[in-house]
């Protein structure tokens, strides 16, 4: 039910108005979402307190706004903060300047441990200075005036956690406000492995979506939602459950999302560059259109869903016939339920195809405690969970939520309890 | 654990060879720098060679340039100095140690792990 | 060559005593100095990188500051641990190179 979400716009910056906004999309925090900047990542930057104001457009969401003359001050890294039942959830990012000696090929990289890292940066000024390189404010290496290559590369054989942090490029007579910036997430997993000991299997995340190494559930990319990311959202939404909407003119364009650990930064799905301002070129989609159509049947792909499928075909590719999935929907739930004390079994209902498992229907308490069904039954239509509280008291009053998450979306329907 | 032992270090004469090796163990030998470091006696520290497993890139110190090879073999996860045309001044204790590996070119000089050392005396 | 040149070559201190060691380098060498402690017939140890960052599982007594040309290793309260001899290290560019060291003694 946790679902915090941090749009960097724009992370190169210019003389143009920038931003950070900070939203807890379907969940009410427990303290107010927090932005800072990440002295961890960054310790030389400015100290500067930020103005952080209510985002009026949205619930539970924060901003940051920089007008145009603070533009020199803002290069470094930030991060945006939410708690729920005691537990915090921090994303990061960096903003740098548009006029850096350097820019990364990407502001964030999600990698495997063990995998065979590089980290780019491309040389965009000239200088007759040596080059550095810094990981966390950590000098690494420097680069002879006269050898400084176009791109400039940090090569990683077998990277592992501590490697992970921020890798930054400028010329020695530059300083932090002429850095590039690069941060490298390190998942303390090998492919495809989640649990404390790294020995279960992921589920195959679709779409770039990212396998979480302490739950095993996949971080969908804005876009996208559902078990598996498959399920593509409404155009220009996001979301767990593709319930925020990107207000811009042409949809999520310039906006970088930054979601929590192991997934970073990337664009909305038809989107890429490091502002997110570039249209996916035809054939490509997803999120910094890294994902390539090979529709089935001649399917038309579209930049930001991919393979349109005919009905009666499914799948990425439209590679499998069968019955159109269908997002799951939860009905015959009121708005308000008033109880006693004592035992209580909440029941939330849901249709949808394929149906949903007694695996994919939850249900969470006010101070975030998920619950998952003592018993369970489905008709031709319904899945109908029944949760079992064995004692409810007053402090348990407040906003539950019944949750479902299937291959083909996920749904939450808030609700109020009462308990006398 | 990280383990660096060094051996083959003795008594040579001058104008002889003699060959260090340098046994790692407890990390990816390949993801690391593996340098040569010495030390004649009651006096400083003095950087030697260096060598990448992971590519074979290598540098040296201008004062044995020519005359020390550093080498490695990663099936054994072993470096070697190779250190023919010895002189006096190259008496000394010989260390072993690692640093980070951030790319062919960018050899980092950060040695967190040494070994203990193995003594090279040159002497007629 | 880069130069590294330490001072003092030598101190006496106490137990408690707020020891300073400085190391200035021949040319501008950013943030890429490292520091070293050496006990007799031993191998050195990292104590700090880039200039100010503690090495992991070395007492935070010990601290590092300093960039471009000039840079000071700072023990706070010396331990009976803690006398030994500390070399600087430039990790600018090649050769790497070492001051010629400092020996804390006891006084």
């Known amino acids: 039910a946790m679902d915090l979400i941090l749009i960097n716009s724009l992370p190169l910056v210019s003389d143009a108005e920038t931003s950070l906004t900070c939203i807890a999309s379907g969940w009410r925090p427990h303290e107010p979402i927090t932005i800072g900047r990440d002295f961890e990542a960054l310790m030389n930057q400015h100290q500067d307190p930020l103005e952080v104001t209510q985002d009026v457009t949205r619930e539970w969401a924060k901003k940051v706004v920089w007008k145009r003359e603070k533009a020199s001050k803002i290069n470094g890294a930030y991060f945006c903060e939410g708690r729920v039942r005691g537990e915090a959830i921090r994303i990061r990012t960096m903003k740098m300047r548009q006029q850096a000696s350097f820019l990364p090929a990407t502001l964030t990289m999600t990698v495997d441990k063990g995998d065979n890292v590089n980290i780019s940066f491309k040389k965009v000024l000239i200088k007759e200075e040596d080059a550095v390189i810094y990981k966390n404010g950590s000098f690494i290496h420097s680069v002879p005036r006269h050898e400084v290559p176009d791109i400039l590369e940090v090569h990683l054989p077998h990277a592992q956690p501590q490697d992970a942090g921020v890798y930054s490029a400028r010329y020695i007579g530059g300083n932090l406000f002429t850095s590039a910036f690069t941060r490298l997430i390190v998942r303390r997993c090998e492919a495809q492995k989640w649990g404390p000991e790294c020995n279960h299997l992921c589920t195959a995340c679709m779409n770039n979506g990212v396998c979480h190494e302490d739950t095993g559930e996949c971080i969908c990319p804005p876009g996208f939602m559902g078990r598996t990311c498959e399920k593509a959202c409404e155009l220009h939404t996001f979301g767990r459950t593709c319930k925020e909407r990107c207000s811009g003119q042409e949809g999520c364009k310039s906006y970088v999302f930054c979601l929590p650990d192991p997934y970073g930064c990337s664009c909305a799905t038809g989107w890429k560059g490091l502002q997110c301002n570039e249209a996916c070129h035809p054939g490509f989609y997803g999120p910094d259109c890294k994902l390539r159509c090979s529709c089935n049947n001649g399917e038309m792909c579209d930049r930001f869903q991919g393979c349109l499928c005919s009905p009666g075909w499914q799948g990425l590719q439209c590679e499998r016939e069968g019955i159109q999935r269908m997002t799951p929907k939860i009905v015959d739930l009121p708005d308000h339920i008033e109880v006693n004390s004592g035992k209580f079994n909440p029941i939330c209902k849901a249709s949808g195809w394929p149906l949903p498992t007694n695996e994919e229907m939850t249900l969470v308490k006010p101070d975030g405690t998920v619950l998952h069904p003592k018993d369970f039954n489905h008709t031709d239509h319904f899945s109908v969970a029944i949760f079992t509280i064995h004692r409810i008291l007053p402090p348990d009053s407040g906003v539950w939520v019944c949750s479902v998450n299937t291959v083909a979306g996920m749904v939450e329907k808030p609700f109020n309890i009462s308990v006398k | 654990e990280v383990q660096l032992v060094e051996s083959g270090g003795g008594l040579v004469q001058p104008g002889g060879s003699l060959r260090l090796s340098c046994a790692a163990s407890?990390?990816?030998?390949?993801?690391?720098?593996i340098h040569w470091v010495r030390q004649a006696p009651g006096k400083g520290l003095e950087w030697v060679a260096a060598i990448s497993p992971n590519d074979g890139s290598t540098y040296y110190a201008d004062s044995v340039k020519g005359r020390f090879t550093i080498s490695a073999d990663t099936s054994k996860n072993t470096a070697y100095l190779q250190m023919n045309s010895l002189r006096a001044e190259d008496t000394a204790v010989y260390y072993c140690a690692r640093s980070r590996y951030y790319g062919q070119r960018l050899v980092y000089y950060v040695m967190d792990y040494w070994g203990q050392g193995t003594l090279v005396t040159v002497s007629s | 060559d880069i130069q590294m040149t330490q001072s003092p070559s030598s101190l006496s201190a106490s137990v408690g005593d707020r020891v300073t060691i400085t190391c200035r380098a021949s040319?501008?060498?950013?943030?890429?100095v490292a520091w070293y402690q050496q006990k007799p017939g031993k191998a050195p140890k990292l104590l700090i990188y880039?200039?100010?960052f503690l090495y992991s599982g070395v007492p935070s007594r010990f601290s590092g500051s300093g960039s471009g040309t000039d840079f000071t290793l700072t023990i706070s309260s010396l331990q009976p641990e803690d006398f030994a001899t500390y070399y600087c290290q430039q990790s600018y560019t090649t050769p790497p190179t070492f001051g010629q060291g400092t020996k804390v003694e006891i006084k």
């Open positions: 040319q501008d060498v950013s943030t890429a």
């Open positions: 880039s200039a100010s």
């Open positions: 407890g990390f990816t030998f390949s993801s690391y720098w």
